[in-house]
């Protein structure tokens, strides 16, 4: 997995008028890291993990950069001509990556009302756009504006690429992010599903990195994919992840089933707790 820094900026317009506020989210290695979500941007670390990476400092630099990016995007939205009545959004996602071989990748993507219409490889300066006519129209509109704006010259895009990588390297120097491994906490719960059946749920939380194997086994043999329901692997706000897997089994056969967990080369099995049903529910998780 490469190290990555991802900026997600969103600005809104209402009945053709660009709103003053904007939302900026920054993800570091896929984790929520910084956020600006008020009229006046103030970069806020997302959890203790982000604070540890940034250290004992103010986030003036991040606030300044994110505010500037927000203003740029608001100007861009103002130049999109086909805005109709109601609420519209323009989103810019900028990603830079540093791979294990030290090679880098940088890209920028624009979305209008949630639909991708323009992408740029910030290293090769190559633009790409979807085939739909709406996307093509929007893309031409935005590209023309960016060309006109002296701030958006080739130098600017090179700077965006370089700045993103510079920030990523700065964050990585903290050492908090570097290839750490945090093992999951695993717990198994049971709940009544229907007559003679119970639903058993295996939850893994607090783990990093996000790659994990979690599955139910009967007498040591994995249950088929379609007899299990998996939750998404989601950030839990602490710089770690959480997920779950559930299946339905016959009451009385609990001891035959185990939850198998594998993470970063470590593995463990977790039995279904015996005794009374803990939670009453009649459907999946």
């Amino acid at each position: 997995e490469p190290h990555s820094l991802r900026y997600n900026l969103t600005v809104l317009s209402w009945d053709g008028s660009v709103q003053s506020g904007f939302l900026t989210e920054v993800h570091l290695d896929g984790q929520p890291f910084l956020r600006c979500d008020r009229q006046k941007c103030r970069a806020k670390p997302q959890g203790q993990w982000a604070e540890d990476v940034l250290g004992n400092k103010t986030w003036d630099r991040e606030t300044r950069d994110l505010t500037g990016n927000g203003k740029d995007l608001r100007m861009t939205l103002a130049h999109i001509k086909d805005q109709k009545e109601g609420l519209h959004s323009l989103q810019e996602i900028r990603v830079c990556e540093i791979h294990e071989d030290n090679s880098t990748r940088s890209s920028q993507h624009f979305y209008y009302d949630g639909e991708l219409f323009l992408s740029q490889n910030l290293e090769t300066k190559e633009w790409t756009m979807p085939q739909s006519s709406r996307a093509q129209t929007l893309a031409m509109n935005v590209r023309n504006f960016l060309k006109e704006d002296a701030m958006k010259t080739k130098t600017h895009y090179h700077a965006m690429h370089a700045d993103c990588l510079q920030e990523l390297r700065r964050y990585l120097k903290s050492g908090v992010v570097l290839r750490r491994t945090v093992p999951p906490m695993v717990n198994v719960t049971r709940s009544e599903a229907s007559e003679g059946n119970i639903t058993v749920t295996c939850r893994a939380s607090g783990f990093y990195p996000w790659n994990i194997t979690l599955s139910w086994r009967q007498d040591g043999v994995s249950l088929s994919h379609d007899t299990q329901q998996w939750g998404d692997v989601l950030p839990d706000g602490n710089g770690t992840y959480q997920t779950w897997v559930a299946t339905r089994i016959c009451q009385g056969e609990e001891q035959r089933f185990t939850c198998y967990m594998e993470h970063s080369g470590n593995h463990s099995t977790h039995p279904v707790p015996s005794g009374k049903v803990l939670v009453l529910q009649s459907h999946w998780q």
């Epitope: 007498d219 040591g220 056969e253 001891q255």
Partner: antibody
Framework: EVQLVESGGGLVQPGGSMRLSCGAS????????MNWVRQAPGKGLEWISY????????YYADSVKGRFTISRDNAKNSLYLQMNSLRDEDTAVYYC???????????????WGQGTMVTVSS | DIQMTQSPSSLSASVGDRVTITCRAS??????LNWYQQKPGKVPKLLIY???TLQSGVPSRFSGSGSGTDFTLTISSLQPEDFATYYC????????FGGGTKVEIK
């Protein structure tokens, strides 16, 4: 006594079909996962199919996928293997085997039938 | 699919010898490994499950070890009734047997 007894083997021509049965006694068949394993003359063991107690997890070896079908009837304490498009290389002794239910098991087969011989030849 | 490779494919030993058979998986299978013994004309018999747990009724001279990709079956002091073919089997991803190791009298 815990027992598995296979039946239905015999001689069949290439391209033909055959259905093997495995009758279980001495244990609660409906609670156990079951398998078919075969052994060609003078060769090693080859696992070919698995079915769990509720028939909602079924696996096949690549060598028989699409040609063989495993099934079970818990009311009759029976396991079945429907074999279609048989080939010469399917000639073997076919065993049914029970997956142990011991705590901490790792898919081990604790009870085996005596086997039934299937010969595919023209 | 996971391949299981046993070595050696055959070995000659004498009564009282310490015998070691290895089984290697083509990818990590955790401890989802079992060992069987099969005598000529007989059905296979489960010896060890979960890589190292002795099945009830199996003599303590049999032991298993290993985790991940490399596993070992050891017979500490070979007895006359131990001359047979031994198979490993994994259940980490569906199920597969190793090719077998024939233990013969020297």
């Amino acid at each position: 006594e815990v027992q598995l007894v296979e039946s239905g083997g015999g001689l069949v021509q290439p391209g033909g079909s055959m259905r093997l049965s495995c009758g279980a006694s001495g244990f609660t068949f409906s609670s156990y996962s079951m398998n078919w394993v075969r052994q060609a003359p003078g060769k090693g063991l080859e696992w070919i199919s698995y079915i769990n107690s509720r028939s909602n997890t079924i696996y096949y070896a690549d060598s028989v996928k699409g040609r063989f079908t495993i099934s079970r009837d818990n009311a009759k304490n029976s396991l079945y293997l429907q074999m279609n498009s048989l080939r010469d290389e399917d000639t073997a002794v076919y065993y049914c085997a029970r997956v142990s239910a011991i705590t901490g098991n790792t898919g081990a087969f604790d009870i085996w039938g005596q086997g039934t011989m299937v010969t595919v030849s023209s | 699919d996971i391949q299981m490779t046993q070595s050696p494919s055959s070995l000659s030993a004498s009564v009282g010898d310490r015998v070691t058979i290895t089984c290697r998986a083509s990818q990590s299978i955790s401890s989802y490994l079992n060992w069987y013994q099969q005598k000529p004309g007989k059905v296979p018999k489960l010896l060890i499950y979960a890589a190292s747990t002795l099945q009830s009724g199996v003599p303590s001279r049999f032991s298993g070890s290993g985790s991940g990709t490399d596993f070992t079956l050891t017979i500490s002091s070979l007895q006359p009734e131990d001359f047979a073919t031994y198979y490993c089997q994994q259940s980490y991803s569906t199920l597969t047997f190793g090719g077998g190791t024939k233990v013969e009298i020297k």
